[in-house]
Amino acid sequence: QDPWAAEPRAACGPSSCYALFPRRRTFLEAWRACRELGGDLATPRTPEEAQRVDSLVGAGPASRLLWIGLQRQARQCQLQRPLRGFTWTTGDQDTAFTNWAQPASGGPCPAQRCVALEASGEHRWLEGSCTLAVDGYLCQFGFEGACPALQDEAGQAGPAVYTTPFHLVSTEFEWLPFGSVAAVQCQAGRGASLLCVKQPEGGVGWSRAGPLCLGTGCSPDNGGCEHECVEEVDGHVSCRCTEGFRLAADGRSCEDPCAQAPCEQQCEPGGPQGYSCHCRLGFRPAEDDPHRCVDTDECQIAGVCQQMCVNYVGGFECYCSEGHELEADGISCSPAGAMGAQASQDLGDELLDDGEDEEDEDEAWKAFNGGWTEMPGILWMEPTQPPDFALAYRPSFPEDREPQIPYPEPTWPPPLSAPRVPYHSSVLSVTRPVVVSATHPTLPSAHQPPVIPATHPALSRDHQIPVIAANYPDLPSAYQPGILSVSHSAQPPAHQPPMISTKYPELFPAHQSPMFPDTRVAGTQTTTHLPGIPPNHAPLVTTLGAQLPPQAPDALVLRTQATQLPIIPTAQPSLTTTSRSPVSPAHQISVPAATQPAALPTLLPSQSPTNQTSPISPTHPHSKAPQIPREDGPSPKLALWLPSPAPTAAPTALGEAGLAEHSQRDDRWL
């Protein structure tokens, strides 16, 4: 059998690892697999990173292909750009390296495409169908630090065997990510187990210094110690346990606190109790009991539905407002009667969608041209008086479903993985936080919470995306965004969905970056962040009344009042990119520094009668979708009467919205 296809392998540097998984997967499946291990599909943005990928992949067969983290939505060609309109699965287009197999051709690129790397030769980048199951995929894992591989000792029975936090076992590493375990076997029959841990003086290092296979007082049987044997001054020996274990009552053996820990899902040694519990992707710790895990509300993920979303355990449903119908993908909404030729290429359309769409949206964009921000970082807003924003729902849903505007929320790291900051290569001048948006967000990596930004590379108008600020603990009030208060009026028990409130989770001690807000039940009071408002428009913040027309039993009615939110601009440095294409000279682009006030969309109706878009999701032909691969599927429909808001160019509130169409999607997003 082919050695290339045998087992996963990895190559690690001091701050990241690339791992090759020779498993046949579609792009979506590969993306999921990397995320489940705490990483992302590989994003080789610099020649140095590409060199590490090259050495990892080696000289494979010409017929083999490996997914990397580049995808492009239909009709998003930008052939003059180094990435040609492709976006990294981390949500940006920053690169100082490309390796396209062919020069850009001027085709219309009608369908969505993903990029695979050739396993042979120059490891060129090829584009193709995202639904093809290619031969394997490359993951990338970022971490806070790494330990160098252990030096072989004279008394060793063989090379150290390393196990990484992403479950790769090998003897071939040069660097070991924080959280890795090294197992050393000695000729004398005993061995040692070491953990790559944080050092008191800073940085990371092995939990025990060498030599590991020498010593007399502890010979011949390691002094009877299961882990470490220490020779005291008076000649007697005492036993110690490696990090993450504690000495048992017999004083010799070591026990894993996680073996008895009552964690429902994942346990990590350490912490005041000797262990700490974590939840798998898609779950979060229960408020009342951190040992238990509760289902993540998918509707909190920005962009999971184009218009409205209802969560339930294990899945969610998308809905469209009156005058719009749900498209076949179960996510996007288009004006009623326009299903054949999608009238809006909106958020759902831009999620991994293989569909074609000939509609032009330039008019809709021009009508809203002032409302986007070039800030790729988090937008900080001055605190303002929170306006009243009362919601009244009367949905006919099962009791465990919650109609909500989608927002992101944190997930927790897997066992032995360090709390992470977003991985960025040397092309970026600072670590940059993820942008969160109610319309076109960039999702954070599952284990990479955002950090506070400094300066950011400028993005062109093509890549502007709306931004919502997340609220962060322990920051001066000047940097806290305004909060819009949302409250629900009481409903009969049979129809009342659980109420939600946005709250900011406690950070893990010592080294946790701020997380996104999660939403939790808190009586009937809901606090939620809404999109900011363009400075030149007074937003119409909506208040929901309890009175509903008899024709619309499941309707959502909004009343309006105005509030203004000030915004702070951010400066942005430049970025240079290079290309390693065998057929064209190096791309050299220089993006000038820019300082712009951030401007955000408010709730919008359709921008033009012929090209209607979501009332709450203004669209731009080149604005970036959330980087969530997804598969399409048929969707049941629910028709409901509600009046539509009249088209207008100025931002106004959504007058009335109903759950006009919905799609049940069980675990269809990631």
Epitope: Q1, W4, A5, A62, A111, E118, S129, V134, D354
Partner: antibody, heavy 124, light 108 residues
Framework: QVQLVQSGPEVKKPGASVKMSCKAS????????IHWVRQGPGQRLEWMGY????????TYNQKFKGRVTMTLDKSASTAYMQLNSLRSEDTAVYYC?????????????????WGQGTLVTVSS | DIQLTQSPNFLSASVGDRVTITCRAS??????VAWYQQKPGKAPKLLIY???NRYTGVPSRFSGSGSGTDFTLTISSLQPEDFATYYC??????????FGQGTKLEIK
């Protein structure tokens, strides 16, 4: 130029076996997967399975599992397909086809070159 | 298994005509669709790959479009040598290829 040349026609009795060959030339044999496809009289094309000359990896259509075996002679750049326990409904033209890897910067798994076909007639 | 259904089964047209053949998949196959031309007694020839990309050497009058479940092969101006049987093929669940039943294009 790339060519796939298949062996001549075969007439077999029900229950017998047939083994046909597909000789490749004009490219590096181990770089491309070889698929086998058959077409009964007036029928649509039917995929039978593939063999990867790089590592001898094979995958067969469930319909033919247990009856079909695909092998290689790398030194002769030749792929073989054997079908056992023949029945009258196995009467068909059998094609070998090369799976493309990439065209003009695109990766794709369509079949870019085909052999001329081997007619197998199963009759008592 | 993914089924492919072509329509029509038979098509009569004249030289110079514009003809369209459609192929519908029983589930989403993205753009992993190819079109082949087969003449009597000959092996199929690749025309279009990845739903819309013309294979090297294929005349520009042949074009493909579609994604998801609905695909189209269009011949903009029929030439005498175009009368043949056309097959669509999906390979999204590679290596499990499936083919349509074929569309026979005849001279009117």
């Amino acid at each position: 130029q790339v060519q796939l040349v298949q062996s001549g026609p075969e007439v077999k009795k029900p229950g017998a076996s047939v083994k046909m060959s597909c000789k490749a030339s004009g490219y590096t044999f181990t770089d491309y997967v070889i698929h086998w496809v058959r077409q009964g009289p007036g029928q649509r094309l039917e995929w039978m399975g593939y063999i990867n000359p790089y590592d001898d990896d094979t995958t067969y259509n469930q319909k033919f599992k247990g009856r079909v075996t695909m092998t290689l002679d790398k030194s002769a750049s030749t792929a073989y397909m054997q079908l056992n326990s023949l029945r009258s409904e196995d009467t068909a033209v059998y094609y070998c086809a090369r799976r493309g890897n990439s065209y003009d910067g695109y990766f794709d798994y369509s079949m870019d070159y085909w052999g001329q076909g081997t007619l197998v007639t199963v009759s008592s | 298994d993914i089924q492919l259904t072509q329509s029509p089964n038979f098509l009569s047209a004249s030289v110079g005509d514009r003809v369209t053949i459609t192929c519908r998949a029983s589930q989403n196959v993205g753009t992993a669709v190819a079109w082949y031309q087969q003449k009597p007694g000959k092996a199929p020839k690749l025309l279009i790959y990845s739903a819309s990309n013309r294979y090297t050497g294929v005349p520009s009058r042949f074009s493909g479009s579609g994604s998801g479940t609905d695909f189209t092969l269009t011949i903009s101006s029929l030439q005498p040598e175009d009368f043949a049987t056309y097959y669509c093929q999906q390979y999204t669940n590679y290596p499990m290829y499936t083919f349509g039943q074929g569309t026979k294009l005849e001279i009117k």
